[in-house]
């Protein structure tokens, strides 16, 4: 707390320069009005003013705006945006994407703060949703952000947003998070031909189920290995050893090396030995010839 | 104890550069702002140039604006004054100084470099 005192003689600021980099606290806190202040908000941000100084403007801010600010000032606050704490930040209604553009900006090449965070969480729920637009800029900023969302959020993610996530943005995502994205990507990709289709809807993969897994196969679409390991070990147990070779294409030959880890070990298992020698690759640990599958599943549903 | 350690003065002809450098030591710098300051014989001390704690903002006087550069590589604890179209009237010592507070209450010191202009 800055100790209320009189502004020196001749010192009164009337506007926002370079002038006040030479004030101490107290003077900052005397010789500038908080609307002057709030109206030259865009200069702040060319001025080196010090950590100390920015604390003395925010206190300035708050004691005029002590319900939050207004958008107006929110969007040029520029660095002293640093200064905001997440608390602040629930006080604000920004609803510009300039003004969010603006924010990340002050805080691009840093991991997502909590203030960031905040900012991002208001932004959204006052929008609605996380339109194209939104996810456009904030992958732009963060592209783990889409990975970050709960399944639950990521449900209010529209179909017609998924055209700005680019494979990237999906790096972090785990399977529960793609199984809420593969649908959304599918019904925007719809309309596409079949190896732009697969292109698209590559990156999404990880939420797709058996039946669009065997239906990808009987299109000649060459998935690398890398795709193929990071599919639902469910939704590929049940792919029969011709569906796989044809929807691994030439890179059916990996499978070899990745015969350990799951889901090609799993899917091993569950494949008879004589299908697996067709592939040629020596994969061992399918079911010996003349050994009965009895599927348990299906018992029970019958019983 | 913190410490900053000027460098790289010396002698230079009217229309030389100079680059000088001042190396912090302790737990300094990232979060304060800097300053290069200059002393010339029987004259107080002038602020030439002084930089913000990210790096992004910059101010001049005057005197030296378009002329002197000042910059900081946080991650090396460094701060650098580069300067162009020397004159005589440039001549004098170059202090580093740091503060938290304000551009004119600084928190720390160097000894300071000799940078004379002279044919």
């Known amino acids: 707390e800055v100790e209320k005192t009189a502004c020196p003689s001749g010192k009164k600021a009337r506007e926002i320069d370079e002038s006040l980099i030479f004030y101490k606290k107290w003077e900052l806190e005397a010789c500038v009005d908080a609307a002057l202040l709030a109206t030259q908000m865009d200069r702040v941000n060319a001025i080196p003013f010090t950590y100390e100084q920015l604390d003395v403007l925010k206190h300035k801010l708050d004691e005029l705006y002590p319900q939050g600010y207004p958008e107006s000032v929110i969007q040029h606050l520029g660095y002293l945006f640093l200064k905001m704490s997440p608390e602040d930040i629930r006080k604000w209604n920004v609803t510009s994407l300039e003004t969010l553009k603006a924010l990340l900006e002050v805080n691009k090449g840093h991991e997502m703060s909590p203030q960031v965070a905040t900012l991002i969480d208001r932004f959204v729920k006052g929008r609605g949703q996380l339109d194209k637009d939104t996810l456009d800029t904030l992958t732009a900023f963060y592209p783990g952000y889409l990975c970050s969302l709960s399944p639950e959020e990521l449900s209010s993610v529209p179909p017609s947003s998924i055209w700005a996530v680019r494979p990237q943005d999906l790096d972090t995502c785990d399977p529960r998070q793609l199984d809420v994205l593969y649908p959304k990507a599918r019904l925007a990709f719809q309309n596409m031909n079949g190896s732009e289709y697969f292109v698209k809807i590559q990156s999404f993969l990880g939420g797709a189920p058996t039946e669009d897994l065997k239906a990808l196969s009987q299109q000649n679409v060459s998935m690398d290995l890398a795709t193929f390991m990071k599919l639902r070990t469910d939704a590929v147990l049940p792919l029969t050893v011709a569906e796989v070779q044809k929807l691994l294409g030439p890179h059916v030959e990996g499978l070899k090396a990745e015969e350990r880890h799951r889901p090609v070990r799993d899917w091993i298992l569950r494949q008879r030995q004589d299908d697996l020698d067709t592939l040629g690759l020596g994969l061992q640990g399918g079911i010996p010839n003349g050994y009965l599958v009895l599927d348990l599943s299906m018992q029970e549903a019958l019983s | 104890e913190v410490q900053l350690v000027e460098s790289g003065g010396g002698l230079v002809q009217p229309g030389g550069s100079l680059r000088l450098s001042c190396a912090a030591s302790g737990r300094i710098l990232s979060n304060y702002n800097m300053g290069w300051f200059r002393q010339a014989p029987g004259k107080g001390r002038e602020l030439v140039a002084y930089i913000s704690w990210g790096g992004s903002r910059t101010y001049y006087p005057d005197s030296v604006e378009g002329r002197f550069t000042i910059s900081r590589d946080n991650a090396k604890r460094m701060v650098y004054l580069q300067m162009n179209s020397l004159r005589a009237e440039d001549t004098a010592v170059y202090y580093c100084?740091?503060?938290?507070?304000?551009?004119?209450?600084?928190?720390?010191w160097g000894q300071g470099t000799q940078v004379t202009v002279s044919s």
């Open positions: 100084a740091a503060t938290i507070n304000s551009a004119s209450d600084y928190d720390y």
